[in-house]
């Protein structure tokens, strides 16, 4: 059982109140985290509550303001970036969101030495991406899909690429599908460690089919948004990687990095770039059929003025039971010899673990092992490797930070976080300074989140950076729900679940049950984290039991569970939710006439299929922005798990796994379908097709669209959405308003 913040004595219980929907929509009980912006081994920057940019020196204990809130306000800056030589700061304003990670902004360069903004050769606007070199104060930026370089902020720019064109050629920034499904960044350029070289990707979207949707706005005529978006089986972007010498950019110009022959023989993706030294770079490539990945280590040949990627430095990672990697193929963390590296991939037992690769993948030395998974390698120093895993006490939904001493033999392992604040903190991430001299731990729960600063040598806690005292005080008179994390064993499958129970939960009573589902491949919903959200309110105020279940296809419990859904999306994820519901009914406190399911995105797909499963278990359900057919979703994501929608591959299951194919089965459930009309990710087309199929089958349903809203349904739409869904559920469960 997971303990929430301590309760007051029963005598005071009458002064306590339940959560309200308003609490949730206002973000009354949101928490803060503290991630230091490290600028050296012992210094970090942080934006203070009053918006000054403050430099902290851990060793001297001193802090001083490097940039005042007045300077920030003078250009309405919402973000900043200090140059590594500490001479300049870029200030970012006019933030304009594009897709999940991408945005454009206006940038001003402030000279710290004279306290003035740099005049002359100002940056154009709006800029799509801008960053400092890792050493000194060179600038690289992307404007109108082309890359520019400045040796100093006041210098005229050197134009590196000339072929950039909106929706056609993207240089240094990803196109839609690479941003969302492969890189998970707004940028596609990478400085070498000392700023000698700049690597960048060029994406050619010329032949990609375009998704077009109306943006209604306020004008007489709606405008049309056009995005090159490859759906499953469609033509994909063509990617090329180039590297330019930033000291002499005009000498030989950008040099293309060769693609490994075994990758280049058919459609492929570039998946990531990791600099090892200024003259060694590591590229990762992936076949379009995403079960083969190649890691290629390339060296700069000064005599060629280009990059050599010998076959002897190609490392192949292949999955025979599913796709390569987890959600993404993991990236290498290089050791100090600049050729060997540490990487997470499946061991012979099908658990993702850290391996040390010195010459070939076949000869990899396994560093961690067990029936649990290593999740992230944070840092490798001369003598230590820091990583996170879910090993501790065999709870897959936990994250603890470990240190392995690699300087000694045999290597010794120490859990840094397991016993720090055991009840409060079971889910951590970390942020390390240069050489791991110091690090910050950010604990996300299950108790109130707390961020702390630690000595990288001794692991000693130095200070609390953020402990959310105000939140703790605000929650003192709130009746929070109880939370349990437990597991069900069904037919050799372990189904972990989180149950959120009303504050005065009584096992002898019957409660309505709401299943919240995501269920996408390599996701995890059952996590030991703190949250006061909509489902907390439903349990606290409306007396519902809410359950989240991690079924087949979910992550961090081994490949057997993860790859079970390979080429069969929409089958086992749904089965496992249904199985769990049956087990919950057996527990005796669920009113089996009042069971609902809801989900968003992939969860909307699963909830729709569960409602249409014909089991009679669910009275009602909600799908927000659901996928309805895998033929409508992005190639990179969909094909990873489903293969191609062709006759000789997996077209049959593409057709069988649609929501529309089950339209008839919605007849006996109450279905609420919700979608934003400007969803660039899961296109409104998905819900339009569900609606059409239901109408054609003469099945009644409820629907809500959000005009001009994307996949996130943000702003005022959020309030409307949760209010609307609350009414729907209360009506379904016959709860009075």
């Amino acid at each position: 059982i997971v303990l929430r913040p301590s309760r007051v004595h029963n005598s005071e219980e009458n002064t306590m109140r339940a959560l309200t929907l308003k609490d949730i929509l206002n973000g009354t009980f949101s928490y803060k985290t503290f991630f230091p912006n490290w600028i050296s081994g012992q210094e970090y920057l942080h934006q203070s509550a009053d918006n000054n940019i403050v430099l902290y020196n851990i060793e001297t204990g001193q802090s001083y303001t490097i940039l005042s809130n007045r300077t920030m306000k003078s250009v309405n800056a919402s973000n900043y970036g200090l140059s590594p030589d500490r001479q300049f700061v870029y200030l970012e304003s006019d933030y304009s969101k594009l897709w999940r990670y991408s945005y454009t902004a206006t940038y001003y360069i402030y000279d710290l030495s004279n306290g003035e903004f740099v005049r002359g050769n100002e940056l154009p606007r709006p800029i799509q991406y801008l960053c400092w070199s890792p050493v000194g104060s060179k600038l690289a930026y992307v404007y109108q899909n082309n890359i520019y370089l400045k040796q100093r902020p006041g210098d005229p720019p050197f134009q590196i690429t000339f072929n950039g064109r909106e929706n056609k050629i993207f240089n240094g920034i990803p196109d839609w599908v690479y941003e969302e499904e492969m890189l998970a960044t707004k940028y596609a350029l990478w400085w070498s460690p000392n700023g000698k070289f700049l690597a960048y990707a060029e994406f050619n979207d010329t032949d990609i089919p375009v998704i077009a949707y109306s943006y209604y706005g306020d004008e007489q005529y709606p405008r049309t948004i056009n995005i090159p978006y490859p759906k499953a089986g469609a033509k994909n972007p063509v990617v090329r990687i180039f590297i330019i010498d930033t000291t002499y950019p005009a000498y030989v110009g950008p040099q293309e990095v060769p693609v490994p022959a075994m990758i280049a023989s058919s459609d492929y993706y570039f998946s990531w770039l990791t600099w090892v030294t200024d003259e060694r770079v590591c590229l990762q490539w992936l076949k379009r059929v995403q079960n083969v990945s190649v890691l290629s280590i390339c060296d700069f040949r000064e005599d060629w003025q280009t990059w050599d990627c010998p076959k002897t430095q190609e490392h192949i990672e292949e999955s025979r039971t599913g796709w390569a990697g987890g959600f993404f193929v993991s990236t290498p963390v290089f050791s100090y010899d600049a050729i060997s590296y540490y990487k997470i991939f499946s061991d012979k037992d099908g658990y993702k673990h850290i391996h040390y690769i010195k010459d070939t993948v076949e000869n990899a030395i396994q560093i961690t092992s067990g029936k649990w998974e290593a999740i992230n390698i944070f840092r490798v120093t001369q003598d230590s490797l820091f990583y996170s895993s879910n090993e501790f006490e065999e709870y897959p939904g936990r994250r603890n930070i470990y240190r392995i001493s690699i300087g000694s033999y045999p290597p010794s392992k120490k859990c840094v976080t397991c016993h720090l604040r055991k009840e409060r903190c079971q889910y951590y991430t970390a942020s390390f300074s240069d050489y791991a001299k110091y690090y910050a731990l950010v604990c996300y729960g299950p108790g109130i989140p707390i961020s702390t600063l630690h000595d990288g040598r001794t692991d000693q806690e130095i200070k609390i950076l953020e402990e959310n005292k105000e939140l703790e005080n605000a929650l003192k008179n709130i009746q929070l729900p109880k939370e349990e994390i437990k597991k069900l064993e069904v037919d050799e499958i372990t189904l972990w679940y989180k149950m959120i129970l009303p504050p005065q939960f009584d096992r002898s009573k019957k409660y309505p049950l709401l299943i919240q589902v995501y269920g996408g491949p390599c996701s995890q919903s059952v996590r030991s984290v703190f949250a006061v959200n909509w489902i907390s309110y439903l349990a606290s105020k409306e007396g519902m039991v809410i359950a989240l279940v991690d079924g087949r296809g979910t992550a961090f419990q081994g490949d057997k569970l993860l790859y079970a859904v390979y080429r069969k999306l929409g089958v086992y994820e749904v089965e496992d939710q249904i199985t769990a519901v049956r087990k919950f009914i057996e527990m005796g406190f669920i009113d089996e006439k009042r069971i609902a399911i809801w989900g968003w995105s992939y969860g909307g797909y699963v909830s729709s299929l569960a409602l249409a499963s014909g089991t009679g278990l669910f009275k009602c359900g909600i799908a927000v922005a659901p996928v309805s057919s895998w033929e409508y979703y992005a190639s990179v994501y969909t094909e990873r798990f489903m293969g191609l929608p062709t006759k000789d591959d997996n077209l049959e299951h593409y057709k069988n796994s649609t929501v529309m194919a089950r339209a008839e089965y919605f007849r006996n459930v109450d279905y609420l379908l919700i979608h934003g009309t400007a969803d660039d990710n899961v296109h409104f087309q998905n819900s339009a097709q569900i609606a059409k199929a239901l109408v054609n089958a003469q099945v009644d349903f409820q629907a809500m669209w959000y005009s001009d809203q994307n996949h996130g349904l943000s702003g005022l739409s959020t309030n409307h959405l949760y209010t609307h869904m609350t009414h729907f559920l209360k009506q379904c469960f016959s709860l009075s308003d």
Epitope: Y248, Y251, V252, E256, P258, V259, A261, A264, R301, E302, D303, W304, Q305, T306, D308, C309
Partner: antibody, heavy 120, light 111 residues
Amino acid sequence: QVQLVQSGAEVKKPGASVKVSCKASGYTFTANIIHWVRQAPGQGLEWMGWIHPGSGSIKYAQKLQGRVTMTTDTSTSTAYMELRSLRSDDTAVYYCARHGGTGRGAMDYWGQGTLVTVSS
Amino acid sequence: EIVLTQSPGTLSLSPGERATLSCRASQSVSTSAYSYMHWYQQKPGQAPRLLIYGASNLESGIPDRFSGSGSGTDFTLTISRLEPEDFAVYYCQQSREYPYTFGQGTKLEIK
């Protein structure tokens, strides 16, 4: 026009050292690698190594490592090759050659050669 | 190291004839983008002169009767119509791997 002019012939005793110079003109000296190649009498060509005057990077043939030193003086646009502990089989014509801009290892301009004779 | 073997050792031809010189590498000297094979001509008492770089690219100022071909391990230098000044020793050279190596040379002599 590009020119590489080498120093004159040398006669050395075994165990001694020789330093051959190569003065470049007609192009930006710091932009191109300078290679050193030797040719024993009546024999083929043997690559000795290269130096990049701009970056200072050097690559020596493993066989000569420890005996050869390549340097440059950018103020005079001159490259130098010093070979120590000379043996009789070091008798050869020593060439400096400019690394071609597009050749990726091809040598587009050569010096006239310096004959080094090692004899007791 | 990569060993380059040239054949024939000596080629006797008359002016106006076509000359085909071969160079075989002990391992591939090509990548997907480029072949790191170059050809030189050397006359007695002179320094070598670059003819072809990157297996098939003609160096500027070299007559177009010279051409190069091949990739991987097998390369050819062709002189379409021999002129009297073409009789010399020809060397191939690889720059794919260190150390750079030269072939032993093919002597092209007047028949």
